[in-house]
């Protein structure tokens, strides 16, 4: 799901699943602004005042970010340039599932998408030879 | 093999114009933005001019502002410098270059001369 | 804009030698630096990315460090083919801008 048009920049954002106890990664992407300090990213989740994470001028901020995602949201800042705006979660939760809104502003204008994430005890499907 | 290859430079008078092209093979070029960066003789390096991958974001350098126009037609895999009212000092060699967390692939470059 | 200026201009070193370049920004870039190297007659060469990211196929005896307004390119031990002039570059901003350039000569 994605915005676009006049004063609109495309979000693109996919569907994800997460390991309860692991990290795991909301993705999405944007077509980059070269001027990188003009580029805002902001997770937000359904439900929840204020942030899962902010990312402006080049770099986290994180003064209104709610407290359940304290000490455990990254983005990729050196894969912003080419417009990674994915969200890194540290030690994934049951409560944790919901939808999540990724949020870009650039020169150009803004934009942005919706994801659906899943947290659960997934594990791989052994093989028996 | 990644390869940008630049063509379309030479000797021009002050006043006049020229369309420098570069040719990309060996990636999807339009998932990557592009630069042009040139080097006068004996000089050091100068970004010249910027594009993303779909065009929605264009910059210039403010020495070739109103006279060069960036373009690219992902369609021909092909990024383009057009450059109206050459000077003096644009005299320089013009390398295309692919834009990922750095310029990470440069082409071999092209010679724009401007001289009477 | 944002400035960018090397130091030193020019330095003459050995084989072996562990050599170190710096690079200074007019205002914060973060770590929004990139370092190339150019050797006469061709293109420039990534070295490193944000700040200290080794491009790969980069031998690992480059490594770059820094963030703010302060950074550093070091050869850990210099060899033949790294005798060349080093750029650093910021694209925290536009426009992008190079620092003037650093000449490694043999001594």
């Known amino acids: 799901f994605g915005i676009s048009g006049k004063h609109f920049i495309t979000v693109t954002t996919f569907t994800s699943a997460g390991n309860i106890g692991e990290d795991g990664t909301l993705s999405c992407t944007f077509e980059p602004d070269i001027k990188l300090n003009g580029i805002v990213i902001q997770w937000l989740k359904e439900g929840i005042k204020g942030l899962v994470h902010e990312f402006k001028e080049g770099k986290d901020d994180l003064s209104q970010q709610h407290e359940m995602f304290r000490g455990r949201t990254a983005v990729f800042a050196d894969q912003v340039v080419v417009g990674n705006a994915s969200l890194r979660l540290k030690n994934v939760q049951l409560t944790d599932a919901g939808t999540y809104t990724c949020y870009i502003r650039t020169s150009k204008g803004k934009g942005n998408a919706n994801l659906e994430y899943k947290t659960g005890a997934f594990s791989m499907p052994e093989i028996n030879v | 093999e990644v390869q940008l290859l630049e063509s379309g430079g030479g000797l021009v008078q002050p006043g006049g114009s020229l369309r420098l092209s570069c040719a990309a093979s060996?990636?999807?070029?339009?998932?990557?933005?592009m630069h042009w960066v040139r080097q006068a003789p004996g000089k050091g390096l100068e970004w010249v001019a910027s594009?993303?991958?779909?065009?929605?974001?264009?910059y210039y350098a403010d020495s070739v502002k109103g006279r060069f126009t960036i373009s690219r037609d992902n369609s021909k895999n092909t990024l383009y410098l057009q450059m109206n009212s050459l000077r003096a000092e644009d005299t320089a060699v013009y390398y295309c270059?692919?834009?990922?967390?750095?310029?990470?692939?440069w082409g071999q470059g092209t010679t724009v001369t401007v001289s009477s | 804009d944002i400035q960018m200026t090397q130091s030193p201009s020019s330095l003459s070193a050995s084989v072996g030698d562990r050599v170190t370049i710096t690079c200074r920004a007019s205002?914060?870039?973060?770590?929004?630096l990139n370092w190339y190297q150019q050797k006469p007659g061709k293109a420039p060469k990534l070295l490193i990315y944000?700040?200290?990211s080794l491009q790969s196929g980069v031998p690992s005896r480059f490594s770059g460090s820094g963030s703010g307004t302060d950074f550093t390119l070091t050869i850990s031990s210099l060899q033949p083919e790294d005798f060349a002039t080093y750029y650093c570059?910021?694209?925290?901003?536009?426009?992008?801008?190079f620092g003037q350039g650093t000449k490694v000569e043999i001594k």
């Open positions: 205002q914060s870039i973060r770590s929004y």
């Open positions: 944000y700040a200290s």
């Open positions: 570059q910021q694209y925290y901003s536009t426009p992008l801008t």
């Open positions: 060996g990636f999807t070029f339009s998932s990557y933005g």
């Open positions: 594009i993303s991958s779909s065009s929605g974001y264009i």
């Open positions: 270059a692919r834009a990922s967390s750095g310029m990470d692939v």
